[in-house]
């Protein structure tokens, strides 16, 4: 008799793929054009990235550091009207893109949560949650929660409101903290909270340290669903050199949890390459006309248009990974097992029941390495075959689909491999 199939876990929409943050509408659309109506015109692009949710804003009225002039129920007219927002929601729904609204109150000011009047602000947030849930949003984000006194209890209350409306609604909290204990204490009292932090940004970009951070985090959080990013808002290029962007994309898309990206991560958008642009929200490079300030700073291969035409680009890799992440059971909700592969390397298996399995091997170092995959670290349910097919490499030159002998696996500097192999009884 065939073995019984493992029961599928309940999957929420945010379990099925990546979230895409657009914190600055104007920078995302190009200066002078940033509003909700314009964003609606970019939804096809988001669809092409196969992202499941758009984390938008903040877009509410906020006069810098002025509680009285901060209205979480009103859209700042610079971004558009409530009608524009409703229209965006409808269009996004048609394209199966969920909309998460950032309600970080004092986003233009010094302290995101104002330094005083915590209770007033918390009440405003509560009212806003109820208002925007009725308006049809799919979730909320609040950032910089380390600046919010009694954050855990407020988050628990906001989570109750959100989940009370529907189990299908999401609350995301963001913190600048990279300390595991602080992160765990925030998660403790909030079962379904998705938390973005700077935890992984401390990886020092080495295989061993990244492996240890990831495994510590997963062990500490148990079987709760988590998210993966390098910060609560910043671009990957704020933390990583260009040669590691592909590697991190592969890792973020294949770890168990929800990958969270900022606009521009898919093309390696780098504020440092665009003089005068703010590090936290540089202008999105749609094509070579996107940064007329200093045209020589932009070449075609830095833009969405240029990378869309290049199958070997970072954007093409992002699209492929996003596609795999949203359709393969082992990547959607499979078990995770990290194991030793030699110094400088981080490798792990993702597997679910009798579905196709995935092996990820990442070389964070700047020298080529032979992988010594230690299958003895793995449980019997996740054993390694002698060969696995190459699904993709982060570097050009490998023949995709070809079987690779796992005992003789060699990786180029900064190379990541995604290999697939079938379940064997």
């Amino acid at each position: 008799r065939a073995p019984r199939c493992r029961e599928l876990p309940a999957q929420k929409w945010w379990h099925t793929g990546a979230l895409y943050r657009i914190g600055d509408l104007q920078a995302f659309q190009g200066h002078g054009a940033g509003n909700l109506a314009g964003l609606k015109g970019r939804l096809d692009y988001l669809s092409s990235l196969k992202v499941k949710g758009l984390v938008l804003g903040p877009i509410h009225k906020n006069q810098k550091d002025d509680v009285a002039q901060t209205d979480l129920l009103q859209i700042d007219p610079n971004f558009g009207s409530k009608e524009d927002f409703d229209s965006l929601l409808q269009s996004a729904k048609k394209k199966s893109i969920r909309v998460i609204l950032d309600l970080t109150p004092n986003y233009r000011g010094e302290n995101s949560w104002f330094s005083t009047q915590v209770d007033t602000v918390a009440t405003k947030v509560k009212d806003a949650l109820e208002f925007w849930l009725q308006a049809g949003v799919d979730g909320f984000q609040v950032r910089d929660i380390e600046n919010l006194k009694d954050a855990s209890s407020f988050l628990a209350e906001w989570q109750n409101i959100t989940k009370g409306f529907s189990e299908d609604r999401l609350l995301i909290a963001g913190t600048n903290s990279s300390d595991l204990q602080q992160i765990l204490s925030l998660l403790e009292s909030n079962k379904d909270l998705l938390l973005t932090s700077s935890y992984l940004s401390d990886s020092g970009s080495t295989g061993e340290h990244t492996k240890s951070l990831v495994t510590q985090y997963l062990n500490a959080t148990g079987n709760r669903w988590c998210s993966w990013s390098l910060s609560q808002a910043r671009l990957l290029t704020s933390f990583l050199p260009a040669q590691l962007l592909r590697l991190y994309q592969l890792m973020l898309f294949t770890l168990p949890g929800t990958p969270v990206f900022s606009y521009g991560d898919e093309i390696g958008l780098d504020a440092a390459a665009l003089p005068g642009q703010p590090m936290e929200a540089p202008v999105m490079l749609w094509d070579e006309s996107s940064f007329p300030d200093i045209p020589g700073a932009v070449s075609a291969n830095m833009t969405v248009k240029g990378q869309s035409e290049d199958p070997g680009s970072l954007l093409s890799l992002f699209r492929r990974l996003s596609d795999q992440r949203s359709k393969e059971r082992s990547l959607l909700h499979g078990d995770f097992h990290a194991f030793s592969a030699g110094p400088g390397l981080f490798s792990y298996i993702r597997h679910w029941d009798q579905n196709e399995r995935f092996l990820v091997v990442l070389n964070f170092g700047d020298v080529g390495l032979s992988a010594g995959l230690q299958a003895s670290d793995l449980p019997a349910s996740a054993s390694l075959p002698a060969k696995a097919d190459l699904l993709l490499s982060t570097q050009p030159g490998r023949e995709e689909g070809s079987p690779l002998e796992l005992e003789r696996l060699k990786l180029e500097p900064h190379e990541g491999l995604l290999l697939r192999f079938p379940y064997a009884a």
Epitope: P275, G276, Q277, P292, D293, I294, P295, A297
Partner: antibody, heavy 122, light 113 residues
């Protein structure tokens, strides 16, 4: 109206640090970038660096290791600090306003200070 | 970095004469997306700070007399003074802002014959 005015010591000892201030009026440093340019006696203009409206800085690569530009928006002042001065740093130092049209920062300079002459000598 | 080459380095002229000076860039300064040429001209009179004369290769800054005419293609630019006045004696610098860092030419000095 728009004005920029440089101030600082006219004489600096070799190996010492130069500190200059550019005080601006008629515009906000939160909206406009300010550049520093220097001109050795009888020579051409050399772009030194910029502090942008958002506070980011960029420097001439030849000077990067010893140059620092900062600002205090509340005082409408931009500061230049350059260490390890040598005699070849003798020049007139200018600050100027980087053009901004309300949307884009195009890199020409529409207002200049009158300059401050700095001599590096023992 | 983009190199800006100005010729001649100095030029002696008489009042009322037409004068042209050249500025060549090592790369094109024409941006095809907006058809603009990212080149500015400055005038620096003796003992004074530079003053913006022309931007976008041919647009005069307000208050600049119309005897100053900027022209040019993507890499070759010209500043023409249709009828030189005594107050025009100065050093003229071109500057590109297409690439970063911004770079200046070495200047053309206009002297009286």
């Amino acid at each position: 109206q728009v004005q920029l005015k440089e101030s600082g010591p006219g004489l600096v000892q070799p190996s010492q640090t130069l500190s200059l201030t550019c005080t601006v009026s008629g515009f906000s440093l939160s909206s406009y970038g300010v550049i520093w340019v220097r001109q050795p006696p009888g020579k051409g203009l050399e772009w030194m660096g910029i502090i942008w409206a958002n506070g980011n800085t960029n420097y001439n690569s030849a000077l990067k290791s010893r140059l620092s530009i900062s600002r205090d928006t509340s005082k409408s002042q931009v500061y230049l600090k350059m260490n390890s001065l040598q005699t070849e740093d003798t020049a007139t130092y200018y600050c100027a306003r980087h053009y901004y049209d309300g949307t884009h920062y195009y890199g020409y300079f529409d207002y200049w200070g009158q300059g401050v002459m700095v001599t590096v000598s023992s | 970095d983009t190199v800006m080459t100005q010729t001649p380095s100095s030029q002696a002229v008489s009042a009322g004469e037409k004068v042209t000076m050249s500025c060549k860039s090592s790369q094109s300064l024409l941006y095809s997306e907006n058809k603009k040429k990212y080149l500015a001209w400055y005038q620096q009179k003796p003992g004074q700070s530079p003053k913006l004369l022309i931007y976008w290769a041919s647009t005069r800054e307000s208050g600049v007399p119309d005897r100053f005419i900027g022209s040019g293609s993507g890499t070759d630019f010209t500043l023409t003074i249709s009828s030189v006045q005594a107050e025009d004696l100065a050093v003229y610098y071109c500057q590109q802002y297409y690439n970063f860092p911004y770079t200046f030419g070495a200047g053309t000095k206009l002297e009286l014959k």
